[in-house]
């Protein structure tokens, strides 16, 4: 049997026998275009494709539509994988989304959505989520029904303001909504009463900016 040489996600890589967390090359569905991603092969059985990570503020997340579309940062540290890749990937199969959060007091929490996909660019990469479980709040901190993605140069939110400019970062802003994991990074002791920070309302409330976040996806049938 011929070995698979291209992989669409980290679950395929895991199932091929490569079970060490790290950077791997993925291939766009129905294409030869490649993208580098961090694969988490340890959490909850492994096979997770990391689509977002924040940990130290080393990467500027106040980026353009094009940058959020194509991705930016380093998969070994802070990065955004790219809306176009995630949209294409999650449009082909059913994926779950796991969001891991850390606060500055040593606590961790997560939200797990049992179905996640992004619409195409023509629909502003609108987010679709169902089936919330987890410890980071009983109510979804990503507005339901899902919102369009907005950036500093592409305002698609429902607010009379421009949420991306007011709150910083590209996100699925509502008006502006209960979360923004791509907000301004604030260090410890400067992370409260910061309304443009890294927000997950139904875990930490208003004005609390988180220490670290990871968004990762995996096929539902993994």
């Amino acid at each position: 049997k011929e070995e698979q040489t291209t992989f669409r996600d980290c679950a395929e890589i895991f199932k091929s026998g490569l079970t060490t967390s790290g950077i791997y090359t993925l291939t766009f569905p129905n294409s030869t275009e490649e993208i580098k991603a961090y694969c988490d092969m340890d959490v909850g059985g492994g096979g997770w494709t990391v689509i977002q990570h924040r940990e130290d503020g080393s990467v500027d997340f106040q980026r353009t539509w094009k940058e959020y579309k194509e991705g930016f940062g380093s998969p070994l540290g802070e990065y955004w994988l790219g809306n176009e890749f995630v949209s294409q990937l999650t449009g082909q199969h059913r994926y779950v989304l796991k969001i891991q959060l850390k606060d500055w007091e040593g606590n961790e929490a997560h939200s797990l959505y049992d179905h996640f996909y992004l619409a195409g660019e023509e629909s502003n990469y609108r987010i679709h989520l169902t089936g919330l479980t987890g410890t980071a709040g009983k109510i979804s901190s990503i507005s339901q029904p899902g919102s369009d993605f907005s950036t500093k140069d592409s305002d698609n939110d429902k607010c009379i303001c421009k949420c991306s400019q007011m709150l910083s970062g590209g996100w699925w802003f509502d008006a502006c909504g209960p979360s923004n994991l791509n907000g301004q990074y604030y260090p410890q002791k400067q992370n409260t009463n910061k309304f443009n920070g890294i927000k997950w309302y139904y875990w930490k409330g208003s004005g609390y900016s988180l220490k670290a976040t990871t968004m990762m996806i995996r096929p539902a049938d993994f």
């Epitope: 607010c159 009379i160 303001c161 008006a175 502006c176 909504g177």
Partner: nanobody, 133 residues
């Protein structure tokens, strides 16, 4: 330092009235819409009433319409909640909160969305209201 300080809560018999006050300081009061929220024991926090800083528009959750009245005094940086015809189901801790007026929903649904609690940046510590039967 931002402060919202509620007062006026207490124990009242069903059918009675209370007037809650919320004194704001540390931010430009006229740039913020104000809301009243409440949380009963074992229940989620819910929005009660809202007032717009720009034109005084108000909004009430269905269960208090016709009984509660929200108002504000910009000169005193204070928002009020007049509560009449109180019923035991009104028993809760009442909180006032402030959000930037710019964070309003675009279009005709903005008033109905005015009590989205996650848009409120500043919160008071709350005042207990107990309605006995």
């Amino acid at each position: 330092e931002v402060q919202l300080v509620e007062s006026g809560g207490g124990l009242v018999q069903a059918g009675g009235s209370l007037r809650l006050s919320c004194a704001a300081s540390g931010f430009d009061f006229e740039d913020y819409d104000m809301g009243w929220f409440r949380q009963a024991p074992g229940k989620e926090r819910e929005g009660v009433s809202y007032i717009s800083s720009s034109d005084g528009s108000t909004y009430y959750t269905d269960s208090v319409k016709g009984r509660f009245t929200i108002s504000s005094d910009n000169a005193k940086n204070t928002v009020y909640l007049q509560m009449n015809s109180l019923i035991p189901e009104d028993t809760a801790v009442y909180y006032c909160a402030a959000r930037p007026w710019t964070r309003r929903v675009y279009g005709s649904s903005w008033l109905a969305r005015s009590l989205d609690e996650y848009e409120y940046d500043y919160w008071g510590q709350g005042t207990q209201v107990t309605v006995s039967s």
